[in-house]
């Protein structure tokens, strides 16, 4: 039940994740114009990886998306680059956990394939999440080092004919809904990992002796039944009982790790 | 690169009007927000006016609101400016400048730049 709810929860906060890395990656506020001792303005400017947005007092906004590729700074390539990586691999990763699902029965998935699918699924959503905070932690800096940049500027500016002076830009909503929306796809990809443990088959050997009935060649177990742990391969239960019917290979029996005595 | 060229500039009277243009060489003139930034003689650079890449937003110096109105013609890859009820003070060196992120009154924004057309009023 543990290891249901874990899986559960952990696809859930990494599709709530995931969601928020797409959404940060399509936003335009990913750096905004800093109004700190800016000089009084009508417009306000604010960027994102796609394109850079003019906004009137009216509320007016005008958007013009980036149309050169070569033109654009490596480093913006670069976040563009780890946010799309960060959405493919939590896509994938969401498609394999819904297989994964203990909670959903598709055929006669056993649940050793479904504790690897849940592993595989964990790890692409930990990937995902640290592709989505190094974008948008490369961002971030690229801010900060331009704003201080910036601010040099303003008070060591050439002075006299030249002024250096330029707008500062600081940090937009879409960083920090990705920081939030790549901790939580990670926190998503580990509770996959941890639920993967509890869904792996135990290996526990069992020792089985086959009876003989003297009379006649029937190999007999007590309950009809083949036992099962709920792990291996015997999830359809075959009666072992067949009423003497057997092929050659049959007439010695093998303990099995899921027979009892 | 985009390659702008000023002109329209001249002597006018007090109170007169001067309309200037600038041309940009540039196919992707679109792309560009405009600018209009001024130096008078002894003076540092002074921001006049901006608009957005399809003239949707327009931004003013308040020295100069009421008085200049900022145009763009993207199929002529154009930026104007028309100067009304001129002032003495208004006499400088007009630039014409571009950027293509952001409409700023700070001129150090502005990346690309003309090289510039003298106004002059008289008296």
């Known amino acids: 039940m543990a290891v249901t709810a874990c899986q559960g929860l952990g696809f859930v906060v990494s599709l709530i994740g995931i969601a928020g890395i797409i959404a940060a990656t399509c936003m335009d506020q990913w750096s905004t114009q800093d109004l700190y001792n800016n000089p009084v303005t009508a417009v306000f400017n604010y960027q994102g990886l796609w394109r850079s947005c003019v906004r009137e007092s009216s509320g007016f906004t005008e958007c013009r998306g980036y149309f050169t590729l070569l033109g654009l700074p490596a480093m913006l390539q670069a976040v563009r680059a780890l946010m799309i990586v960060g959405i493919v691999l939590g896509a994938i990763g969401l498609l394999v956990s819904i297989f994964a699902l203990k909670c959903i029965r598709i055929g006669s998935m056993e649940d050793s394939a479904k504790a690897n699918m849940t592993l595989t699924s964990g790890i692409m959503f930990i990937v995902s999440g640290l592709c989505a905070i190094a974008g948008v932690s490369v961002f971030a800096n690229m801010l900060v080092t331009n704003f201080w940049m910036s601010t040099a500027n303003m008070y060591t500016g050439m002075g006299g004919m030249v002024q250096t002076v330029q707008t500062r830009y600081t940090f937009g909503a879409a960083l920090f809904v990705g920081w939030v929306a790549g901790g939580l796809t990670l926190i998503g990809g580990v509770m996959m990992c941890i639920a993967c443990r509890g869904l792996a088959p135990e290996e526990t050997n069992y020792k089985a002796v086959s009876y003989h009935a003297s009379g006649h060649s029937v190999a007999y177990k007590p309950g009809g039944f083949k036992a099962s742990t709920g792990f291996g391969s015997n999830t359809k239960n075959k009666k072992i009982y067949d009423g003497g019917a057997r092929t050659e290979d049959e007439v010695q029996s093998y303990p099995s790790k899921h027979d009892y005595v | 690169q985009v390659q702008l060229v000023e002109s329209g500039g001249g002597l006018v009277q007090t109170g007169g009007s001067l309309r200037l243009s600038c041309a940009a060489s540039?196919?992707?003139?679109?792309?560009?927000?405009m600018g209009w930034v001024r130096q008078a003689p002894g003076k540092g650079l002074e921001w006049v006016a901006g608009i957005t890449w399809s003239g949707g937003i327009k931004d003013y110096a308040d020295s100069v609101k009421g008085r200049f109105t900022i145009a763009r013609d993207n199929a002529k890859n154009t930026v104007y400016l028309q100067m009304n009820s001129l002032k003495p003070e208004d006499a400088a060196i007009y630039y014409c400048?571009?950027?293509?992120?952001?409409?700023?009154?700070?001129?150090?924004?502005?990346?690309?730049w003309g090289q510039g057309t003298q106004v002059t009023v008289s008296s």
């Open positions: 540039d196919s992707t003139f679109s792309s560009y927000i």
């Open positions: 400048a571009a950027n293509a992120i952001q409409l700023t009154r700070r001129s150090g924004d502005y990346a690309y």
